[in-house]
């Protein structure tokens, strides 16, 4: 996990300012409104999981 301004997050993850760490883009399926999801690859979202 890197701070913003240093090396980017690893592939498949994106920086969350809210959590102050890199987060898995895969979790955007369940939490599409998380701040870091904006930085994840723009793949079409899967159906939202209950």
């Amino acid at each position: 996990e890197q701070a913003p301004g240093t090396a980017p997050c690893s592939r498949g993850s994106s920086w969350s300012a809210d959590l102050d760490k890199c987060m898995d883009c895969a979790s955007c399926r369940a939490r599409p409104h998380a701040d870091f999801c904006l930085g994840c690859a723009a793949a079409p979202p899967a159906p939202f999981r209950l």
Epitope: G12, D18, L19, D20, M23, D24, C25, A26, S27, R29, A30, R31, H33, A41, A43, A46, R49, L50
Partner: antibody
């Protein structure tokens, strides 16, 4: 460092009640979803209940086997959450773990607490 | 509910060799991009510990001897080379939908 400290558990008679507690530290508790997972020799690891974060309207979900019997709740101001268990039966016996998840996997775990339902 | 079937229930592997554990889900737990399958290690008297998330992503701090693969319904956890400290029970878990379910576990013994 991250810690999930559990309390509660012990011996309870069939039909009785028990409340488990879990206090979190070392991470942004209010942003995480919290779950209870239990383990027994008969059923292995079994997810029991989940409470989501404020941004998800504190939505709760339960395993079918505990619906109407167990209630999960949280107190973000004190970084703690709870499992109120009522009408306990022998099949509820096991080790109960509190766990945090951002969305999918169980990242942090409590130390576990034993619950025995027996007369 | 999605049923997770783990095989074998137990295995014994010689020190330095490869351990392979399989997990099959009763329905697909993958999108075109990600698989919602995770692996844990549990030692006696301890809670489970996350090893692999999303089928193949190594959790921070977990040795590279552990690797995961698979998609759809069939997933594999590999440990190579196995070490004495790997003696434990290993579980798979899906997060495709509620209820989240776990496999029955695979007990690994090091010979």
């Amino acid at each position: 460092q991250v810690q999930l400290q559990q309390s509660g558990g012990g011996l309870v008679q069939p039909g009785g009640s028990m409340k488990l507690s879990c206090i979190a530290s070392g991470f942004t508790f209010s942003s995480y979803w919290m779950s209870w997972v239990r383990q027994s020799p008969e059923k292995g690891l079994e997810w029991v209940a989940e409470i989501r974060s404020k941004s998800d309207n504190y939505a709760t979900h339960y395993a079918e086997s505990v619906k109407g019997k167990f209630t999960i709740s949280r107190d973000d101001s004190k970084s703690r959450f709870f499992l109120q268990m009522n009408n306990l039966r022998a099949e509820d016996t096991g080790i109960y773990y509190c766990s945090s998840t951002y969305a999918d996997y169980f990242h942090y775990w409590g130390q576990g607490t034993d619950l025995t339902v027996s007369s | 509910d999605i049923v997770m079937t783990q095989t074998p229930a137990s295995l014994a592997v010689s020190l330095g060799q490869r351990a392979t554990i399989s997990c099959r889900a009763s329905q697909s737990v993958s999108t075109s991009t990600y698989s919602y399958m995770h692996w844990y290690q549990q030692k006696p008297g301890q809670p489970p510990k996350l090893l692999i998330k999303y089928a193949s992503s190594l959790e921070s701090g977990v040795p590279a001897r552990f690797s995961g693969s698979g998609s759809g319904t069939d997933f594999t956890l590999n440990i190579h080379p196995v070490e004495e400290d790997d003696t434990a029970t290993y579980y798979c878990q899906h997060s495709w939908e509620i209820p989240y379910t776990f496999g029955g576990g695979t007990k690994l013994e090091i010979k």
